[in-house]
């Protein structure tokens, strides 16, 4: 189960971003740092260090067009990607409790 301030790597990180960002999609780097041709901002922050809900949400794509860098669209994952986390390490109830606690 996901716990705040733990490392998230690989597929587990993608799954979690999908869940947090929903239909908005997400970036692997924030708009301001999209100069690198191979952006792995969130990988460095969440996998090699640790991250929480607030940090994860900064990588979600912004719904308002005017705030989005349209030159680099948010991630659109292939059809075979699960819409929500599928790993047995990820439990919806635990995530829900964590997000509610962090938002208080």
């Amino acid at each position: 189960a996901y716990r705040p301030s733990e490392t998230l790597c690989g597929g587990e990180l993608v799954d979690t971003l999908q869940f947090v960002c929903g239909d908005r999609g997400f970036y692997f780097s924030r708009p301001a740092s999209r100069v690198s041709r191979r952006s792995r901002g969130i990988v460095e922050e969440c996998c090699f260090r640790s991250c929480d809900l607030a940090l994860l949400e900064t990588y979600c794509a912004t719904p308002a067009k005017s705030e989005r860098d349209v030159s680099t669209p948010p991630t659109v994952l292939p059809d075979n990607f699960p819409r929500y986390p599928v790993g047995k390490f990820f439990q919806y109830d635990t995530w829900k409790q964590s997000t509610q606690r962090l938002r208080r």
Epitope: R38, R49, G87
Partner: antibody, heavy 122, light 107 residues
């Protein structure tokens, strides 16, 4: 040519230290996360350690945590593994491996060095 | 940690045979599964990533399948150069773990 070349292996006594190097060429080293993977004689593959592209983040297997230190020098296109307090069970061929570009949002080791043998014995 | 279990551990086959190696994960890893080939004295070589995607330059006789906890690597028609040890590896979470290997020998 795109390649990784390890060096620094050899025979060392238990409790001793060794520093492995991995020289990268033919690609932009500074934008790839890098890894060390080892293989004991006649055994399978075991992930040892990873370092982020900038060198700002590291991860270690429990079996080497506190004894091994991974680092990199992007100006020299070189990856390092400092191994201290070596044990007999650390005897293995050590490979450096490049992490995949995540444009596909998958992770895999797409480039490997030929390996360097570390033998820990008295 | 996620445990990866391969079967069989060893397999004897002939040139032209169709062979399948399986890999089971102790937890659901979606399709975050890679396959590597290793020949004696050589470094591993990536064959397949994301469970079924063929790495560039790998012959089409290699194919991968599966999702969740059960995966397979199939070689449709064995060639002499395919006799080697094959490893699966999960990339769902750290530590990235490998299967124990399947040694494919010539019959």
């Amino acid at each position: 040519e795109v390649q990784l070349l390890e060096s620094g292996g050899g025979l060392v006594q238990p409790g001793g230290s060794l520093r492995l190097s991995c020289a990268a060429s033919g690609f932009t080293f500074s934008v790839y996360d890098m890894n060390w993977v080892r293989q004991a004689p006649g055994k399978g593959l075991e992930w040892v350690s990873s370092i982020s592209s900038s060198g700002g983040g590291t991860l270690y297997a429990d079996s080497v945590k506190g004894r091994f230190t991974i680092s990199r020098d992007n100006s020299k296109n070189t990856l390092y593994l400092q191994m201290n307090s070596l044990r007999a069970e650390d005897t293995a061929v050590y490979y450096c491996a490049r992490d995949s570009d995540t444009s596909s949002y998958y992770w895999y080791y797409d480039l490997w060095g030929r390996g360097t043998l570390v033998t820990v014995s008295s | 940690d996620i445990q990866m279990t391969q079967s069989p551990s060893s397999l004897s086959a002939s040139v032209g045979d169709r062979v399948t190696i399986t890999c089971q994960a102790s937890h659901d890893i979606s399709n975050y599964l890679n396959w590597y080939q290793q020949k004696p004295g050589k470094a591993p070589k990536l064959l397949i990533y994301a469970a079924s995607r063929l790495q560039s330059g790998v012959p089409s006789r290699f194919s991968g399948g599966g999702s969740g906890t059960d995966f397979s690597l199939t070689i449709s028609s064995l060639q002499a150069e395919d006799f080697a040890t094959y490893y699966c590896q999960q990339s769902y979470s750290f530590p990235r773990t490998f299967g124990q290997g399947t040694n494919l020998e010539i019959k």
